[in-house]
Amino acid sequence: AGVFELQIHSFGPGPGPGAPRSPCSARLPCRLFFRVCLKPGLSEEAAESPCALGAALSARGPVYTEQPGAPAPDLPLPDGLLQVPFRDAWPGTFSFIIETWREELGDQIGGPAWSLLARVAGRRRLAAGGPWARDIQRAGAWELRFSYRARCEPPAVGTACTRLCRPRSAPSRCGPGLRPCAPLEDECEAPLVCRAGCSPEHGFCEQPGECRCLEGWTGPLCTVPVSTSSCLSPRGPSSATTGCLVPGPGPCDGNPCANGGSCSETPRSFECTCPRGFYGLRCEVSGVTCADGPCFNGGLCVGGADPDSAYICHCPPGFQGSNCEKRVDRCSLQPCRNGGLCLDLGHALRCRCRAGFAGPRCEHDLDDCAGRACANGGTCVEGGGAHRCSCALGFGGRDCRERADPCAARPCAHGGRCYAHFSGLVCACAPGYMGARCEFPVHPDGASALPAAPPGLRPGDPQRYL
């Protein structure tokens, strides 16, 4: 058992150009607080995955009001450490997420509003009992400076808090085979009561006769290193030579209960009995109560009057997550018209419109023809945000400035010959065809298929297409 401790030294603008605007203003004073989430191992898990090693919220910092015209300074911080107790062995490798939250203290309806200012994450190796480790992390234009350490709670000692110490029975020395407990020289290492043969480096016990493995080790005596690469068959037998970790048949194999919870099999699954201060299906939730204000964005906290009972956040419309920290994706309803890009800014939806469109939802088609002229009698047509000219006969191009060759598209059917004419084109039809485009066959008896030839025109005469 032990405690992970986090000390925030400063939160403010990072070095370099583009200093962030102060998160608080005279109109909207605010204060900061922090949340830390710890997970065992060097896992690259999503921010939303459970904080299996535990989580903690800081107190609220002092109220801060920006001085007009002044650059954003380092912001005033909450007092004290963030402490995450762990009841189990300290894993040695861990992942962390540290979030900086802003509590706005303006005249919001329904109390203060919370918003996430910055989130930093990392993966570290850390031995329990060592000195404070210093770190600097950047999130956008913000910089967070902090220190952290893991320390064991007596009677536990060691880099994993797995060795136990007891007060000396004799004033001068420890019993046979037992060493003094550094740095507590007046105490002695307690006799190990683990299962016989349990690895002293990679195993530990909290009950007589048991042997529980540190992360990375497996086997009944914790002597087999876990390998993810050398297993030939994913469900083959476990062997001390390959060091393959094979899922056991029981639901409690590998103990799914975090934070020192004990697992018991049920007819259909498993059940975790959690230590004080933890709850959840796998004891993954640390003892935050409603008094800690865990619900963000105006969420209503229910239950959780003491650390042994779980709280539930009832989120206001538009927010979700166990702490109402996530916004629902409102852009999935595609409110922007005419191909506009939707941006959810939190307080409002914004649409970034394509060229030729404007308005809050890109609903206005801009008049592309304004100030544009189409030459040679052409008329301007709007559509799709693009300017287009409908050209008079004989002209083409974007602005109708080019003379068009009306015969270029070979408009005369059935081998008819095309002649350009000042008013358009004329088709000279091959024998047996007639019509403006030579599209109608002439029947052998002289009658045409459709329509009848106008009086005075014989089949085969050139026909002007007007």
Epitope: R337, G340, L349
Partner: nanobody, 120 residues
Framework: EVQLVESGGGEVQPGGSLRLSCAAS????????MGWYRQAPGKQRELVAG???????IYAESVKGRFTISRDNAKNTVYLQMSSLRAEDTAVYYC??????????????WGQGTLVTVKP
């Protein structure tokens, strides 16, 4: 102020059908986009079906061919006909609307939700 009032939720057996309704009322000049989201326990809220700002109809992949969205513009109401319901459709169904108000501003509104439970 704008209100979205959902109705039609309830308990149904797998393979059964339900029809949800959502009526919008208040200082509405026009409805730009309107549809249905759902949120199952412990899951993210997700879009089920909707009418976009361009009046296109969109559906989540998991409900295509089973759910149909329709609307009555005169009543500012949208409907979700749910057929061949499965256990995984169990969720709270929320109506959502992007509305242009009399002030010409646009605002996004949510209903309070209606519970749909699919169990044998």
């Amino acid at each position: 102020e704008v209100q979205l009032v959902e109705s039609g939720g309830g308990e149904v057996q797998p393979g059964g059908s339900l029809r949800l309704s959502c009526a919008a009322s208040g200082s509405i000049l026009s409805i730009n986009a309107m549809g249905w989201y759902r949120q199952a326990p412990g899951k993210q809220r997700e879009l089920v079906a909707g009418f976009t700002g361009d009046t296109n109809t969109i559906y989540a992949e998991s409900v295509k061919g089973r759910f149909t969205i329709s609307r009555d513009n005169a009543k500012n109401t949208v409907y979700l006909q749910m057929s061949s319901l499965r256990a995984e459709d169990t969720a709270v169904y929320y109506c959502a609307a992007d509305v242009q108000l009399f002030s010409r501003d646009y605002e996004f509104y949510w209903g309070q939700g209606t519970l749909v439970t699919v169990k044998p």
